[in-house]
């Protein structure tokens, strides 16, 4: 029995990403032991929630426990029995919820009341519900992607562990784009910030670091489409409204009730002379680009550099990780590789809004038309953002890797939520022992 | 959209049993739960029960122990199996699915489509 292994004594976690489309489950597990390590927690399980966003369930409020139950009860498989009682529950919302907020505090409340009553039931340990700022969503996702990429580790290695680790310990910025929000957080190579407000400090493992971070609510790729219809419907002559960002042969009625039902599109609101108007899709990317500009207010700057809408922006330093919708929208258009230039995307995405809707639904059959119909606006609006919103040009866009998992692990904010709540990420460097005294006999 | 027809209710002694029915048609892929409720009159609306697109059972208080609900796949159909009823189990009982919006676009909506009801009356 001298070198037989001890069974290895693993810790489990759950968040639960409440988005503003839907909501995902997702169950970390890590060796005990090494909880203090970097790179040792890992997902073992993604449940995405059948449905909409939990901000959509006002009208259905008492029913949010039955929309959580199949993906509970998936965890309460994955987890070993013996491991429920300590493992933590967390659930952050995000911009779907800021929005609700916006709109109703009250409402907001009751969402989150039923949430934590359901999710109590359970035979976890629950820590709480809550909505999450943009600032923490922009935070935890970079420290997420640097975590997965071995960034705070201090250990020097000939080998690389993971893609896109340049076997050195400069950190990637992280670019997030949900349905309702996106955010852009980095290590900028000036120290100085003009913007305390977009500034936070972190010590981990050892080492300062010096973020900048900003979440633009309303700029998600469904709240930017909401926000782009809504300007243009304003000079439209009558019902029809013909979109170069969808494709031609497209149609869609719109309510306008369903247009100005959310507090992003306040500013464009007006009184019309039609309760419906009719997309017709035209199917032009330059001018969709055009449109999409339109959003982003960049005559007004009170710093050095803005992003857009006056808000500051460091210049752009190293390499970056897009995920979510970035990744989701650049992978379905099969323009993730870092083989492919911007000059190759653009004329790609030319390509693919100008393919009549007949012929798209014909190529992607499998996929749903609801779905099908928005990667024109979604890539283009995309492009826009990155170029034009946060200045990335033909030559940095190499710095960008759509990234959609790092080592089987998504990337977002829910794991270094975690990491942050359960401590951890030690903001010194553990002392490394040889070797770890439970693991012979 | 989604269509959904109920059956099975009628008058029933104190202590007797129902079956309800309800057949769902349509876009019924974006379901995530079907359920039944009730309105007794001068009462609000109460979820009975519900199951959802993974199987999972809920039952209100009020039911658990005498009410059961399932489904079969094959028909798109959800059952309440109602035993030991009681005199203050009367009322209109409706047949409820809800998920996703297939018809909305860029942010998913919450559809929620109801049957027409069907009467349950316990009396000797």
């Known amino acids: 029995t001298q070198n037989k292994a001890l069974p290895e004594n693993i810790k489990y976690g759950i968040v639960l990403d409440a988005g503003s489309s839907h909501t995902s489950l997702y169950i970390y597990k890590w060796p005990a032991e090494k909880e203090n390590d970097t790179g040792v927690v890992h997902q073992v399980e993604e449940c995405r929630v059948k449905g909409p966003g939990i901000s959509k369930y006002v009208q259905k409020v008492n029913e949010i426990g039955i929309y959580l139950t199949d993906c509970m009860e998936r965890a309460r498989e994955v987890i070993p029995r013996s491991q429920h009682q300590e493992t933590p529950v967390y659930l952050g919302a995000t911009a779907g919820m800021r929005l609700l907020r916006m709109e109703s505090e009250e409402l907001a409340d009751r969402v989150l009341d039923v949430v934590e009553r359901s999710l109590s039931n359970y035979p976890f340990d629950f820590q709480g519900a809550r909505i999450i700022t943009g600032q923490e969503e922009g935070a935890y996702g970079w420290i997420t992607i640097n975590y997965l990429l071995g960034k705070f580790s201090q250990k020097t290695r000939w080998f690389s562990i993971v893609p896109y680790e340049t076997n050195n310990q400069e950190t990637f910025g992280a670019l997030d784009l949900g349905g309702a929000s996106t955010q852009i957080t980095f290590v900028p190579q000036n120290q100085t910030t003009e913007s305390p407000d977009n500034a936070l400090q972190f010590r981990l493992y050892g080492k300062d670091y010096n973020v900048y971070t900003h979440s633009f609510l309303c700029y998600g790729k469904d709240q930017a489409l909401w926000q782009k219809l809504a300007k243009d419907i304003q000079v439209a002559s009558n019902e029809i409204l013909r979109d170069p960002c969808f494709h031609p042969g497209y149609k869609k009625v719109v309510n306008v009730s369903d247009l100005y039902k959310t507090p992003c599109t306040k500013r464009f609101e007006m009184t019309l002379p039609f309760q419906q108007f009719e997309i017709q899709g035209i199917g032009n990317y330059q001018q969709c680009h055009q449109s999409v500009l339109e959003l982003f207010n960049t005559s007004y700057c009170p710093y050095s550099q803005c992003a857009f809408n006056g808000i500051f922006l460091p210049p752009l330093q190293g390499d970056f990780g897009a995920f979510s919708a970035f990744y989701f929208v650049m992978n379905f258009l099969n323009l993730t590789s870092e083989k492919v230039s911007q000059e190759k995307v653009t004329e790609m995405m030319k390509k693919f809004c100008s393919q009549p809707w007949e012929e798209i639904k014909t190529s992607y059959a499998g996929v749903k038309e609801k779905y099908l119909s928005e990667y024109c606006f979604s890539g283009t609006y995309i492009l826009s953002l990155l170029l034009q919103g946060y200045h990335f040009t033909a030559d940095s866009w190499e710095h960008i890797h759509f990234i959609g998992k790092i080592q089987g692990s998504d990337a977002g904010w829910t794991l270094g939520y975690m990491l942050n709540l359960t401590n951890m990420i030690p903001a010194e460097q553990p002392l490394s022992t040889p070797l770890s005294h439970s693991t012979y006999v | 959209q989604v269509q959904l027809v109920e059956s099975g209710g009628g008058l029933v002694q104190p202590g007797g049993s129902l079956r309800l029915s309800c057949a769902a048609s349509g876009s019924i892929s974006s379901i995530a739960a079907m359920g039944w409720y009730r309105q007794a009159p001068g009462k609000e609306r109460e979820l009975v029960a519900a199951?959802?697109?993974?199987?999972?059972?809920n039952l209100a208080d009020s039911t658990k122990g005498r009410f059961t609900i399932s489904r079969d796949n094959t028909k798109n159909t959800v059952y309440l199996q109602m035993n030991s009823l009681k005199p203050e189990d009367t009322a209109v009982y409706y047949c409820?699915?809800?998920?996703?919006?297939?018809?909305?676009?860029?942010?998913?909506?919450?559809?929620?489509?109801w049957g027409q009801g069907t009467q349950v009356t316990v009396s000797s």
């Open positions: 409820n699915a809800w998920g996703e919006d297939d018809s909305s676009w860029f942010g998913t909506d919450l559809c929620d489509y």
């Open positions: 199951i959802t697109s993974g199987g999972n059972t």
